[in-house]
Structures are given as C-alpha cells and as structure tokens.
Interface confidence: medium
C-alpha cells in the first residue's frame, strides 16, 4: 500500500506569451498522494470553476484560458493540498501579447495656415508599437517643425501650404504593423492681394480696366465696390488658375471714382478679407490753370448762363481739345454733384465753381484767365457751404478721395490771389456781395479761434465770420 | 466730318458667324476722344447696344452678348470688325456702327446707315 | 444691364408740346443721352448729358433729367419730328443701355 506524500510541483508554472483572442495555458504537474485537490488564482483571486473563460483539465493540473484578452495579463498560480503536509504553489505570469492596433484614427483636418495641428493616432499593442507617419508614399521626417508626440499623434507647428497633403499613421511591434486609412490635412490660406488695382487719371468717356489678383485657400471670391456701391457682375471678367483669382472690371469714366477690389475666403463659419483700392480721377477736373494758353469768347453755354455777367469774356483753356465743350461738360457734372447741397450752400457754390471753371478774362497779347479772389473763395468754404466742405475734407482725410476736394472742380482758396494785393488781378463773385446784406440771416460759423472779418469784402455795415488765418491783410 | 459705313453679307446661315466691318473715313479710330460701337435694331423693335472697341484697342461687350460676341480693329485700313457666332433667326436685324464721343458726353454722335442681316437656312 | 423705361407712344398736336420721359432706377445721376429715327433712316443724337444741343439741332429740343425720370421736351412739335425716340445711358461698367423707344406722333 502507497505511502501517503505531500504534494511536490514538479513543472513549475512558467511564464506565458500569448495573442489576444488565442488560447493559453499554465501546466502545474503535481505528484503527491493521495491525489492532490489543485485550485488556480489570478493576481491572488481564486478563479472559479463555473467561469467559462477557463477549462481545468487533467485533476486541476491543465489551465486553459480559452479567448485571451487584455485584461488577462497577471500572475497565475496553481495551489495543490492533499492534506500531507502543507499546501505548495507555484506562480508563473500571463503576458498577453497584442498586434498593434489604432484606437484612435487620425482624421481628416482642415486648419489655417500658421496654426498648429494635430492630427491623432493612439495604439494599443504589447510589445508597445512604434508609431511612425507617412505622408503620400513618402516616410515623413520629423524637423523642428513637425514631431512625433509619445502619444503617437503628429503634430506640426506653424503649418505651411506644402504641408497639406496626405497622410496615415503605422504602428508597429515584433508581431505586426497596423496602418491607419488616408486622412487629408488641408492647409487654408487667409485671402491675400497679390496685384492690387491700379489708379488712373483719364480724359472723360475713357475705357478703363482695373485689374485684382487674389490669393488663398480656398480660392476667394472677388467683388467690387464703386464709390461704395456693388458693382454688378456683367462688367466683371474672372479667371482662375493654381488658387489665384484675376478679377477684370472694366469701366467706362463719366466721373471719377474710388475702386475697391475685396477678396474674401470662407474658413468654417468665419470669413477672412483683404481690401485693396484705387481711384479714378478724369484728368480735365484737376489741371492746373497756371501757365495755360487759351482764348477769350464770349459765354455761349447753358449751365453757368443764370451765373456769369452777361455778354461777359471768359477764358478757354486750349489744352482740352475742344475746350468749350469740355468746359462745359465739366460745369455740367459737377452740377450734378451740387443736387445734394444745401440751399444756403448750393447757389454760392455754382458762383464758385462757373467763376472758376470759366474764368473772367482780359483778352490782350496773351489772353490771361482773372481767377477768383481768395477772400470770396473762403466764404464760400467757411460760411455758405462750411457743412458741406468739413464733409469733403472728412472723406479725403479718411482716404476716400484724392485730393481733398471731392469730386468737384473746386479751387484751392489758399492759392488764389488776394484782392487786397491787387484788385484788379482777381474776380469778385457778384452772387456772394448781393447775399452779403443778408447775412444776419446765415448761421454763424463756429471756430477755435476768435472770429475775424474778411477784411473789404466790398463795402457794407455785414461781414463774414471766418477764422483770422484768411484775414489776407 | 467723320463718316462711318458698315459692310457684310446680307444673308447668314443659323450656327454660322456673322461678321461685319466698318470703314471709317474723315477721323482715325486711334483718336483719344473716340470709341467705336456696335448697336442693332431687329425688325420693329428698339435699339440693342451689342459692343465697343475704345481708341486703344480695348473692347466691352453687352453682357446678354459677351459670350458670342468679338470686336477686332485694322487701324491700317482705321476699320474695325464685329464678330457674332452661332447665329439663330433671333439676330436678325439691322446692324449699325457709331461713333461715342467724349466731346458730347459718350454719344453717338455719327452713325452708318445700318445694313440689314438676316438669319436663314 | 442697367433698365430704362419709356412709353411706347405719345401724341401731341402741332405746334404744342411733347414730352417723352425716359424711367430709371436714380437716372439723374447719369448722363442721358436722346436719339431721333425716322423710319428707314440712323438714329440722330439730338441731346447729349441731359440737356445740351449739338449744333444743328433746333432750340424747340430740350432735356432735362433728375430723380429716377430723364425727360426729352419738344416745345411747339413740328410734322417733321414724328419719329422714334431712344432715351441712352453709360453704365459706369462700360456697357451702354438704351430705352425701348417712344413713337412720338404728331397730330
């Protein structure tokens, strides 16, 4: 008859590698006697004989794990007692071991160009993955600017256009490489304005083309605005080649203008937009009648009939093909100009600009053009159309018009003779003295200085109130 | 005094190009102060503005138009040419060419006495 | 295409005045130009920006244009100036724009 034996392990557990989803198994080969009752724990838990993850086999001896999974990493240990002695144990370690598998995908990404962007890719796998990107077909090296995260997520700093392209991330141990899908990273770039339009100064009835190139991504849309309003498709001639938009506008000049070309690009819910302007003056408004040749004739226009003394000699400029007709026609658009004046503003404002466009005149060896005395010039600005010509400076300070003097022929008062130097040498403007017994009836002109007199602004008990600066003594 | 004179052929197949010249005579099409349009008149209706070449060479077309219309200039012969292909019965109509000048606001202010086209297979 | 609008008939009786109105979204601020035709016959400016006159037309021609209406007035209408009348306009955006034309008759 046996003897009785404790219980000797005689295969120590070892440890185990094994693939999630395969089978592993710990043998724990026992000789004692009587027969051993053999029990398994994990991590110091007694696994349980009805738990279906597991099959123990040949008296307890055989663990079989029948699906790995991660969570069965641990120390197992098999534990035998037959009652001869003490209980022996021997442990051996599950090492589940994974195929490299992406738990979180990059995706793909649209950012503006000179952010950062990240785009992810989170492993799972045991020996832990190596994580590498490529970008095309191409293995993508990391600079100062691009880097690899230990998370395995690619980040790159202030991206660039050459940047946007495909990529996918690879993650890699001793037992596989897993590969993410393609993902697109698009680089957007805020609008930009390559060539901007150009100024002109053309005669009237002329054909202009402004022209605006615009860059970004996505590729902008081009609108104009003429003087603050849309300009409307019809006249507009667009082209687009590599992200670059040419916009065309092609204009016919009756009057001068402000031409604004804005480029404008959606990222997202938000727009960016560049601006850029230029100004199209006619070149007859701003010639300078100094040193001009011309004739003297007498008045045979309409527009200014009401305005010039009758049967009265006025000089025309010949550097204007035909220059009773381009006079004319400049009188007459800056008539339209005048319909939004003031009442007080406007009838002293047509004496000025029918005074100064056709200017009295002297016919003798030289013809020589009379202009307006200073004086009279300055109550037009500071007293009839004060409101107005604060308006006018406001616009051109603000850059909405070259030269300060809108879109009218007006004169530069500053240099215009004064009729305290030479009577003679200047033309009064009849209008401006008749209204000059009136003038109490004027609103006065607020300035930051003390108010002064215009000195013998033709002889009368009233005088204008303008600042001492045009006091022209 | 400009003179202005239109010439082409009277009868044009639908899809075909209609083309038409100008001679213009007392003035050069290169002056600054000028440029040189194309207007219509079918039968019974009103004038229809189709294009203009400017004294530089630069041309604008009518936006109902622009995709079938051309205008070209000879300045050696101070002609220029008008250009209207995939012609239906629709263009039938008088055509006439005109002078805009600056002197008097852009207006026409010399005209051809037209020459009447007409689209037919 | 900028619209202009204008009625297609008007009488007038000889020697009285007619008037033919040309209609446009803020007309008075462009320049209005007016042509004649006669039937057979080119169209002949008989006013240009607004109101001028070229030479040879005569004084009983005249133009006016503010707000949205430019209006041709023929003051004491001759039998010579039954005709078409075409009201025209530049758009700043180099096209030019013509009215559907008015037959003036004159009775």
């Known amino acids: 008859e046996k003897l009785p034996k404790a219980p000797v392990i005689t295969t120590p557990l070892e440890t185990v590698d094994a693939l999630v989803e395969e089978v592993a198994t710990f043998m724990c080969a026992v000789e004692s006697y009587p027969q051993p009752e053999i029990s398994w724990t994990r991590n110091k838990i007694l696994i349980k004989l009805f738990d279906t993850r597991y099959s123990i086999r040949e008296n307890g001896q055989l663990l079989t794990i029948l699906s790995v999974e991660d969570s069965d990493d641990g120390i197992y240990c098999c534990i035998a007692n037959n009652g001869v002695g003490g209980a022996v144990e021997s442990c051996g370690a599950l090492q589940v071991k994974m195929k490299p598998k992406i738990t979180r995908p990059p995706i793909n990404v649209k950012i503006i160009e000179g952010l950062k962007a990240v785009l992810p890719c989170t492993t799972m796998g045991n020996p832990k993955p190596s994580v590498s990107w490529i970008k095309g077909d191409n293995a993508l090296r990391e600079n100062s600017r691009i880097a690899v995260l230990e998370s395995g997520s690619l980040r790159i700093h202030n991206v660039q256009k050459e940047d946007a392209g495909q990529y996918r991330c690879v993650a890699k141990n001793s037992l596989g490489t897993a590969y993410s899908k393609l993902v697109k990273l698009e680089v957007e770039v805020f609008a930009r304005i390559l060539r901007a339009p150009e100024s002109h100064n053309v005669t009237f009835g002329s054909f202009v083309t402004l022209r605006c190139t615009a860059i970004g991504i996505p590729v902008p849309t081009i609108s104009w605005i003429e003087n603050g309003n849309a300009v409307s498709s019809g006249s507009i001639q667009e082209s687009v080649k590599d992200r670059v938009i040419d916009s065309r506008l092609q204009l016919f000049i009756t009057k001068p203008g402000l031409y604004t070309c804005i480029a404008t690009n959606k990222h997202g819910e938000k727009f960016s937009t560049a601006k850029a302007a230029a100004t199209v003056s006619i070149a007859e408004w701003s010639k300078s009648q100094k040193d001009s040749q011309g004739y003297c004739a007498q008045y045979r226009g309409e527009v200014c009939d009401a305005v010039l003394a009758k049967d009265a000699l006025v000089f025309f400029n010949t550097s204007y093909r035909d220059p009773e007709d381009a006079q004319e026609l400049l009188i007459h658009t800056a008539w339209n100009e005048l319909k939004a004046v003031s009442p007080l503003c406007r009838p002293a404002a047509e004496a000025l600009l029918c005074n100064h466009l056709f200017q009295e005149c002297s016919p003798g060896v030289v013809p020589t053009p009379m202009p307006i005395c200073r004086e009279y010039c300055l109550a037009v600005k500071e007293l009839f159309c004060a409101k107005e010509w604060q308006a006018m400076e406001g616009k051109a300070h603000r850059g909405l018009y070259r030269s300060g003097m809108h879109l009218l022929p007006v004169p530069e008062c500053s240099k215009l003779p004064s009729m305290h130097r030479d009577p003679t040498a200047c033309t009064r403007l009849p209008y401006l003295d008749y209204k000059k017994e009136n003038i109490t009836t004027f609103p006065s002109i607020t300035s930051s200085r003390p108010s002064a007199d215009i000195p013998n602004l033709p002889a009368s008990t009233s005088s204008f109130a303008v600042s001492p600066a045009y006091s022209m003594t | 005094q400009v003179q202005v004179q239109e010439s082409g052929p009277g009868l044009v197949k639908p899809s075909q190009t209609l083309s038409l010249t100008c001679t213009v005579s007392?003035?050069?099409?290169?002056?600054?102060?000028?440029?040189w349009s194309w207007i219509r008149q079918p039968p019974g209706k009103g004038l229809e503005w189709m294009g203009v070449?400017?004294?530089?060479?630069?041309?604008y077309y009518s936006p109902s138009l622009k995709s079938r219309t051309s205008i070209s200039r000879d300045t050696s012969k101070n002609q220029f040419s008008l250009h209207l292909s995939s012609v239906t019965p629709d263009d039938t109509a008088v055509y006439y060419c005109?002078?805009?000048?600056?002197?008097?606001?852009?207006?026409?202010?010399?005209w051809g006495q037209g020459t009447q086209v007409t689209v037919s297979s | 295409s900028y619209e202009l609008t204008q009625s297609p008939s008007v009488s007038v009786a000889l020697r009285q005045t007619a008037k033919i109105t040309c209609g446009g979204n803020?007309?008075?601020?462009?320049?209005v130009q007016w042509y004649q035709q006669k039937p057979g016959q080119a169209p002949m400016l008989v006013i240009y920006?607004?109101?001028r006159r070229p030479s040879g037309i005569p004084e009983r021609f005249t133009g006016s244009n503010s707000g949205n209406t430019a209006t041709l007035t023929i003051t004491g209408a001759q039998a010579e100036d039954e005709a078409d009348y075409y009201c025209?306009?530049?758009?700043?955006?180099?096209?030019?724009?013509f009215g559907g034309g008015t037959h003036l008759t004159v009775l």
């Open positions: 025209h306009v530049w758009g700043s955006t180099a096209s030019a724009d």
């Open positions: 005109a002078r805009g000048s600056s002197r008097v606001a852009a207006a026409f202010d010399s």
């Open positions: 070449i400017a004294y530089d060479g630069s041309t």
């Open positions: 007392g003035g050069s099409i290169t002056a600054r102060y000028y440029s």
């Open positions: 920006a607004d109101s």
């Open positions: 803020r007309i008075g601020g462009k320049s």
